[in-house]
Interface confidence: medium
């Protein structure tokens, strides 16, 4: 299911994830009760064409919503996980409220206000960087964009757009935030672990060797202070004190989707019962920050030959 989020007391409008280019009618339901959501605008939550509108949204609206597209030969159902958050008390916008990061390499760059096309908004859109209103002439708001002239690394940060959605004579505030980072010709970015998947469980056989590869990508070109490593129960492998478990010397370099990646391999010479209770963390880090994927081991189930 797809995810959408909004802030308490703001407007939130979402689209049916199954929509595609369909022009057929869309019905919305509360997934847990199967109760149909009305189209009457007098309701705080109502359906308008393929869209579900929360005017305004409340924390208790959080949940899974189902949308059904009814066409003559096929009904398509989509699910949308909606989370309404309380407004953050401080300026630090948590990751779960951030839209995709924008990466700029041009001297003049534009940032698009996320989700704005879903709303009935009127200019101007107000823009803030790290919660401060942008008033320098280098920053120009035009339609749903923020244009930045003479971009430098100092322009990196979290940019919030704020606009008004009008419905039935009432105005509702909407805010959306995304990060902006400046790229070089090549670019360095927050690490992305490509393997193992997040919260992965790997099957192993007691007494047999096991190896787990951790791969992460860091951008293209510069990978200053980029590293991939393993921790066991939050301790660096070398300090864990278990000779059977070793991290391979060196890092294998590779390319994936035109990005530079590193791989570190964790080897267990003979898996024991005790190893199944340990937490293995794959860490990828560079100047932008650190990310970790935790994996656990579980005993491989014997194949039943009956």
């Amino acid at each position: 299911s797809k995810s959408s989020w909004g802030l308490e007391n703001e407007a939130l409008i979402v689209r049916c994830p199954q929509r595609g280019r369909s022009t057929y009618p869309v019905e919305w339901y509360y997934s847990d009760t199967n109760e149909s959501i009305p189209t009457q605008k007098r309701n705080r939550i109502f359906v308008s064409r393929d869209r579900l509108k929360f005017l305004p949204a409340r924390v208790e609206d959080s949940g899974i919503y189902a949308c059904v597209i009814r066409s003559p030969n096929l009904n398509k159902t989509g699910y949308l996980n909606v989370t309404i958050h309380k407004k953050p008390p401080s300026c630090n916008i948590p990751d779960y409220l951030m839209y995709s990061t924008v990466r700029g390499s041009d001297k003049n760059f534009k940032i698009t206000c996320p989700t704005i096309d879903l709303y009935n908004w009127t200019a101007p859109v107000q823009w803030f960087k790290n919660c401060k209103a942008l008033q320098e002439p280098r920053f120009r708001a035009h339609r749903s964009y923020l244009f930045i002239d003479n971009v430098t690394h100092d322009d990196e940060g979290d940019y919030t757009c704020q606009f008004t959605h009008a419905e039935n004579g009432t105005n509702y505030i909407v805010t959306a935030t995304r990060s902006f980072t400046v790229e070089e010709k090549g670019f360095s970015m927050f690490p992305v672990i490509t393997n193992p998947p997040y919260n992965h469980t790997m099957e192993v056989e007691i007494g047999k060797p096991a190896s787990i590869a951790c791969s992460a990508c860091f951008g293209k070109g510069s990978h200053f202070l980029a590293d991939v490593l393993w921790q066991i129960n939050k301790t660096v492998v070398g300090n864990f004190g278990e000779a059977r478990i070793q991290e391979e010397e060196g890092r294998n370099e590779s390319s994936s989707n035109d990005m530079d990646c590193l791989t570190s391999v964790l080897r267990i010479t003979g898996v024991t019962e005790k190893d199944l209770s340990l937490e293995y963390d794959c860490l990828a880090l560079n100047l932008h920050g650190m990310i970790r994927h935790t994996i656990r081991l579980r005993r491989k189930q014997p194949i039943d030959h009956r």
């Epitope: 510069s222 990978h223 202070l225 490593l229 860490l283 100047l287 650190m290 970790r292």
Partner: antibody, heavy 117, light 107 residues
Framework: EVQLLESGGGLVQPGGSLRLSCAAS????????MSWVRQAPGKGLEWVSV???????FYADSVKGRFTISRDNSKNTLYLQMNSLRAEDTAVYYC???????????WGQGTLVTVSS | DIQMTQSPSSLSASVGDRVTITCRAS??????LAWYQQKPGKAPKLLIY???SLQSGVPSRFSGSGSGTDFTLTISSLQPEDFATYYC?????????FGQGTKVEIK
Amino acid sequence: EVQLLESGGGLVQPGGSLRLSCAASGFSFSHAWMSWVRQAPGKGLEWVSVIHSGGSTFYADSVKGRFTISRDNSKNTLYLQMNSLRAEDTAVYYCARIGKGGGFDYWGQGTLVTVSS
Amino acid sequence: DIQMTQSPSSLSASVGDRVTITCRASQDIGSWLAWYQQKPGKAPKLLIYAASSLQSGVPSRFSGSGSGTDFTLTISSLQPEDFATYYCQQSYSTPPTFGQGTKVEIK
């Protein structure tokens, strides 16, 4: 205000050991990449080692296998354990934080290490 | 390792002069370059990072430019407190490496 304060330098014989400390304050130490940079008398700057709180470490080839960088985030302190010291390790050792764009944005005042018999 | 070469190794200038120091990298380093000022007996001080971004608190008479392999530090109007040694440093790849330094002396 960001402050870095090195200590532990002194005179040591070739082959000897020394442990440098760097007390940090005024910033989120546990999230920072921290580094040691040295400067031999009358010479230029030479990077020595760097550490991340996740446990990642890097060393200059000239000190690999002899020096160990570590940190104690609960004490906001960076360390450099120097073993098998040589005359060419004589230098002022600076502790520095790595900031935006990979520059060393804050430096300590330095501590002098002299390796001589 | 990436080699960083500064020129000149020293220069004499007067207060009010425009001073330019260059730094060349042995390979393309994009904009991953920093400039430092160091006075005798003191720790280095970061002036410029990412080739052209002025570090907070540094006077605007200092500016950096360039990308790829060739970089320049410019002091638009030299002040008495600017007489010092200047270093460039690349942070494109590990290990970070410094130029050999440029000493700016009073003419």
